[in-house]
Every structure is written in C-alpha cells, then in structure tokens.
C-alpha cells in the first residue's frame, strides 16, 4: 500500500517519541563518531520536517524515500571527510547505492572510549535534571557502539533503563537498587547485540534463503502445534522485519515488528498456547516477550517422518516441483519434533537431506539411493552431543575462569594470528557457555550451547573481517554458516605459525592492576596467557598452568605489599626470567 509521503506514514504509525528515538538510533549507527549534540540537531530537523509532511503530504520533498531524506541529512555533516575519511565518498552516490555505501562502512569495533559508569548520585542528578536528554544519550551511546543493534528492541532496553532510574533514584540505597539493574541491562544488551549481529550476517553474507531456513527451524521448535502454512507466513514476515533493520530501515522495521506482534497475538490459538501472558503486555514488552517465549508442547502422536520423506513414492516428484518448500516442510517437521536439537544441527540435517535428494532423484533407482538417508544423520547428531558432554565435564571440573583459560589456549593455538584483544573477548564469551548451558538437563543443552556458540563465533568472524589476518578464520567463517562451529572445532594447532618475538614490556605489570575489578584483573591475566601462547605455541598445559599460577601469586603478593610499584618492578623481573626458563623462551 503506497503512501504519498513515507515519512508522514511512519511518523503517524510510530508516534513522535518512537519516531525520534529510531531516527537517532539510525543516525548513530551510521555516523558512529559524531558528537551527541550533532545527532540530536539532525534528528530534530528530520522530526520538524516529518511534522510538515503529516500536516500536508503533498508538501515539498515529502514524497522522497526515507533513504533519500536521511542520507541527504547525514551528508550535511560538515566534518564528514575529516572524521570518516572515505565514507564521505558515499555522499557522491545516488540512492540506493548511497545507503549501501553507508551500510558497508558500519564499524563493528569502533574506536570509541569505554563507557565508564559515573557515581550513582551523579547519574541520578543527570536523570532528574533532563530525563529526555539522559535517555537519548543512552540510545546514542549504545547505538554507535553496536551498529547492528535491533532498533525496536533497543527502545525496550531504553524503557527498562528509564524504569530503573525512576525507581532507584528515589530508593533509600540508590546504588544497591540501581547497580544490579544496570549490570543486568548491560549483559542482556551485549547478548542481544550479538544475537542480532548473527541475524544480519546471515542475511548479508549468506542471503535470505539462509535466514529463512534458520527461522523455519527456530519457529517450528517454538510453535510445534502451528501448521506449516502458519509457520511459513511468520517466517516471511520475520524475514522482512530483520531485512529492514539490518538494512538500516529502522522505521519500517519497527512498524512491521509491531504488526507482526499484533498478528501473532490475534492468531495465538493457531500458533502457540504459551503466548497468552506476552499478548497482555504493552507493545515493546509484548514483542520482546514473544521473541523469548518458551517452546510450546509438541503435539501428541506425531507420525514418523520417514513416511513422507523417505518411504513415499512421491518424494522426488514433490521435491522437483517445489524444492525449497519441500525442504522447508522437512525442516519444519524435523524441528517441531526436536526441541532438543540446536537450530544449526537441524539445518545440517536438512542440508544433508537436500544433497541426498539432489544426487538420488537424478539416479536410476532414486528410492534405493535415498532409502538410508536418515542413517546419515546419526554422526551429525552425535558430534555436538559428544562435544557438549566433554566440554561441560571440563567446565564442571575447572569453573568458568579456568575453563575460559583452557579455551584461550585452545583457540590461540588454532588461530594465533588473530589479535590478542579479539582472542580474549571471544574465548571469554565461548567460556560463558558453561555457566549458561551446562546447568540445563540433556534435552536443553544442545540448543542452548551450540546456538550460543554460533553467536559468539560470529563475533569472531565480523571482527576478523575488518582486518583479516588468518586464512583459516576466513575459511571457517565464509564456507558455511551452519558449519562454522564444527569447522573451528576441527582446527588443530597451526603448524605454519612463526612464534612471536618475546617482548618483556608485554609482561610488565604495575600497581594499577590492584585497583581493578575482578573481571578486569582476569582480562589482564588472560591477555598475558594469550601472549605466552603466541610466544610459545608448543607449551604444554602443565607449563602454562605453572606460569599462570606463579603470575597469580605474584599479583596477589605485590597487591598486598606496602610499596606496590617497587614490588611489581622487582618481582616482575624475576617472574619474567623464571617464566622464560620454564617455557624455554
């Protein structure tokens, strides 16, 4: 349904508050280095213009596309070339090339200072002094650091952020009330950002078909009572929503997401029995709740899959007539029966089934050829099951910190060319799979663990893509979306790697380490561990453990000393010498 003025249409649909917030997010995700005040000024100008179009849709420029309007506005930024370099060249292009150009320049790891949390009283004063600016600043800071953050979900985070300050700034103990809430929002926000980044990577690097396959599998697990046609409709709509958000069309995305939530709630009887509570909530909470809703119970007495997908004489005929639909039906039927499988495993099974049909349906006796296709699934299912079992045992034995360290060593040996901060960040996140998933019963472990690992490995892939240094990482990241984790798991020690030259400065520590939080101190130690492995890739677990134990004791001793700095200087030299001897450096 075409509208005379797209900007007026979206303003009316979304309302002024959401319109302004979404435009701010869009601008901050594109121009990640621009000061807050500049963005606010641009957003206000766009909003005023939108209001003129609401008043008269035939007014000048109101018929222009949102990309044209927003792109023109972004290109008025005076310091574009000084701040962004070649991104300024985007402004010489016409739509749609200009928007594509802006999208290509989104930076997953922008050179921005770490967000330091002020004192609680300072934050509460700022919140009370100008609530609107305070909340806009939150949107801006998150959006510029997470250029693919799911915009309608960021509105939900901002709503919770506001609620936390509204409640806690009146509390007797403001800090005790506020800090845990902010920690929770930060952790959930990072997780949400990473999950969305995988969706965008899936769409942008592997195409709509890959995303739709993922969505069929996930929604079929979640809504096993829904008919295939219903799941297909939801997948089509969900794909549109995420395509829009990943493409920077945030107003359309938020509008369509609201429509999808409305549709799901109006049709919950034919979708899932678990939606009732979600559908009673206000819009932002409703959409979030639906996205996180637990899997519905599987229908009783589902027939064997073999009847339709192996034994039927029409398998090849049906496949030939509508390949993707037939494969979609296979994926739907398999996924709704297997909430205990990861989505990526289900997609591997569907790929195996597709490859078998492609080969067998062109053979002289198709049925004879594909009759044993389900037997080929067994090793594919057992591989992640065994891996999760082994790693959960290791996690339970070591605890999170030491489990992370084991992964740090493992991954540094696999891909030692990758930058140390990236290896530390990714391995720490990989290690969190233990506390996140190993507590679950067997039936929930694989979907929790393997789908989480897909999200974390995508972080490695997007960070590596910015500055590629390892052919092995590139290969695992680009060959197959669903086989990324098995690809990385299969990597052995990189025998071609030339060890890094020893640099004493890397292992020099100062008294400032004593004032760091436990998390920051762990990161310091883990950074040193990665560097050790890069210097001595053939070091044994025992050697590395001995050095790390000595290092922990050294930090503990010097942090207790009266003259900490002298202790770090003198004991540090001894530690470096002892470590070199222990590792034969």
């Amino acid at each position: 349904d075409a509208h005379k003025s797209e900007v007026a249409h979206r303003f009316k649909d979304l309302g002024e508050e959401n319109f302004k917030a979404l435009v701010l997010i869009a601008f901050a995700q594109y121009l990640q280095q621009c000061p807050f005040e500049d963005h606010v000024k641009l957003v206000n100008e766009v909003t005023e213009f939108a209001k003129t179009c609401v008043a008269d849709e035939s007014a000048e420029n109101c018929d222009k596309s949102l990309h044209t309007l927003f792109g023109d506005k972004l290109c008025t930024v005076a310091t574009l070339r000084e701040t962004y370099g070649e991104m300024a060249d985007c402004c010489a292009k016409q739509e749609p090339e200009r928007n594509e150009c802006f999208l290509q320049h989104k930076d997953d790891n922008p050179n921005l200072p770490r967000l330091v949390r002020p004192e609680v009283d300072v934050m509460c004063t700022a919140f009370h002094d100008n609530e609107e600016t305070f909340l806009k600043k939150y949107l801006y800071e998150i959006a510029r650091r997470h250029p693919y953050f799911y915009a309608p979900e960021l509105l939900f985070f901002a709503k919770r952020y506001k609620a936390a300050f509204t409640e806690c700034c009146q509390a007797a103990d403001k800090a005790a009330c506020l800090l845990p809430k902010l920690d929770e929002l930060r952790d959930e926000g990072k997780a949400s950002s990473a999950k969305q980044r995988l969706k965008c990577a899936s769409l942008q690097k592997f195409g709509e078909r890959a995303f739709k396959a993922w969505a069929v599998a996930r929604l079929s697990q979640r809504f096993p009572k829904a008919e295939f046609a219903e799941v297909s409709k939801l997948v089509t709509d969900l794909t549109k929503v995420h395509t829009e958000c990943c493409h920077g069309d945030l107003l359309e995305c938020a509008d369509d997401r609201a429509d999808l939530a409305k549709y799901i709630c109006e049709n919950q009887d034919s979708i899932s029995s678990k939606l009732k509570e979600c559908c009673e909530k206000p819009l932002l909470e409703k959409s979030h709740c639906i996205a996180e809703v637990e899997n519905d119970e599987m229908p009783a007495d589902l027939p064997s899959l073999a009847a339709d997908f192996v034994e039927s004489k029409d398998v090849c005929k049906n496949y030939a007539e509508a390949k993707d639909v037939f494969l979609g039906m296979f994926l739907y039927e398999y996924a709704r029966r297997h909430p205990d499988y990861s989505v990526v495993l289900l997609l591997r099974l569907a790929k195996t089934y597709e490859t078998t049909l492609e080969k067998c349906c062109a053979a002289a006796d198709p049925h004879e050829c594909y009759a044993k296709v389900f037997d080929e699934f067994k090793p594919l299912v057992e591989e992640p099951q065994n891996l999760i079992k082994q790693n959960c045992e290791l996690f339970e034995q070591l605890g999170e910190y030491k489990f992370q360290n084991a992964l740090l060593v493992r991954y540094t040996k696999k891909v030692p060319q990758v930058s140390t901060p990236t290896l530390v960040e990714v391995s720490r996140n990989l290690g969190k799979v233990g506390s996140k998933c190993c507590k679950h019963p067997e039936a929930k472990r694989m979907p929790c663990a393997e789908d989480y690992l897909s999200v974390v490995l995508n972080q490695l892939c997007v960070l590596h893509e910015k500055t590629p240094v390892s052919d092995r990482v590139t290969k695992c990241c680009t060959e197959s979306l669903v086989n990324r984790r098995p690809c990385f798991s299969a990597l052995e020690v990189d025998e071609t790697y030339v060890p890094k030259e020893f640099n004493a400065e890397t292992f020099t520590f100062h008294a400032d380490i004593c004032t760091l939080s436990e998390k920051e101190r762990q990161i310091k130690k883990q950074t040193a561990l990665v560097e050790l492995v890069k210097h001595k890739p053939k070091a044994t677990k025992e050697q590395l453990k001995a050095v790390m134990d000595d290092f922990a004791a050294f930090v503990e001793k010097c942090c207790k000393a009266d003259d900490k700095e002298t202790c770090f200087a003198e004991e540090g030299k001894k530690l470096v010498a002892a470590s070199q001897a222990a590792l034969g450096l």
């Epitope: 029409d314 005929k317 030939a320 007539e321 509508a322 390949k323 037939f326 039906m329 349906c361 062109a362």
Partner: nanobody
C-alpha cells in the same frame, strides 16, 4: 503476474505423436519446478510429468512412462512435452503448471495453470 500459455495440441491418430509447448512469464522460470497435468472430460486433474528447475530430476506417471518426454529451455522460458505412441486414453486437456506459494505440493488445483491445450487421440 504468472502467465502460462500452452500450445501444440490437436487431433492425432492412435500411435501418433505431438509436441506440446508452454510459454512462461511473470515468475522466475529458471528456478521453478514445472509440471504437466491433464484432465479428461468429466474427470479430475491427473498428474502426467514433473521436471525440476535444472532438468536433473524428471518423473513420469506410470501411464505415460516410456512414451512421453518432458523437457525445458530456461533461456527461452519454455516447457515442452513430447508425446509418442499416443493412445485414445491420452485424450484430455493438457495444462502446464507451477507451484503456487501457500498451496500443498501435489495439489494441482491450487497450482498456477495455463488455459490448457486439447489433445484428442482418435482414428
């Protein structure tokens, strides 16, 4: 919009041959499976043959296997059915068809179809 136009039907004696063509437009022909179905007077639709998008997979109904040959030209967006050793029971209106989103696979009443071309086998 999807358009399918069959041609090549006519009256033929038993044992004779015909070649049906179907010109397709309005959809991605080269990535779509295609089907020939037929309908004899007073009967329902009967599946005749299926060909995959890349022509690698071809299936025939038992009643026509060995006598009919389905083929396609993706460059020309055209589907063919070569019918040899025709029998009186092959008399029907022949339709080319393709899957319509939202329909059930094999539910040919719901597929996109052309207007059909009449084939009459009679001496």
């Amino acid at each position: 919009q999807v358009q399918l136009q069959e041609s090549g039907g006519g009256l033929v004696q038993p044992g004779g041959s015909l070649r049906l063509s179907c010109a397709a437009s309005g959809f991605a022909f080269s990535t779509s499976g295609m089907v020939w179905v037929r309908q004899a007077t007073g009967k329902g639709l009967e599946w005749v043959s299926t060909i995959s998008d890349d022509s690698r997979i071809i299936r025939y109904a038992d009643s026509v296997n060995g006598r009919f040959t389905i083929s396609r030209d993706n460059a020309e967006n055209t589907l063919y059915l070569l019918m040899n050793s025709l029998k009186p029971e092959d008399t029907a209106v022949y339709y080319c068809a393709t899957y319509r989103a939202g329909s059930r696979i094999g539910s040919y009443e719901d597929y996109y179809r052309g207007q059909g071309t009449q084939v009459t086998v009679s001496s």
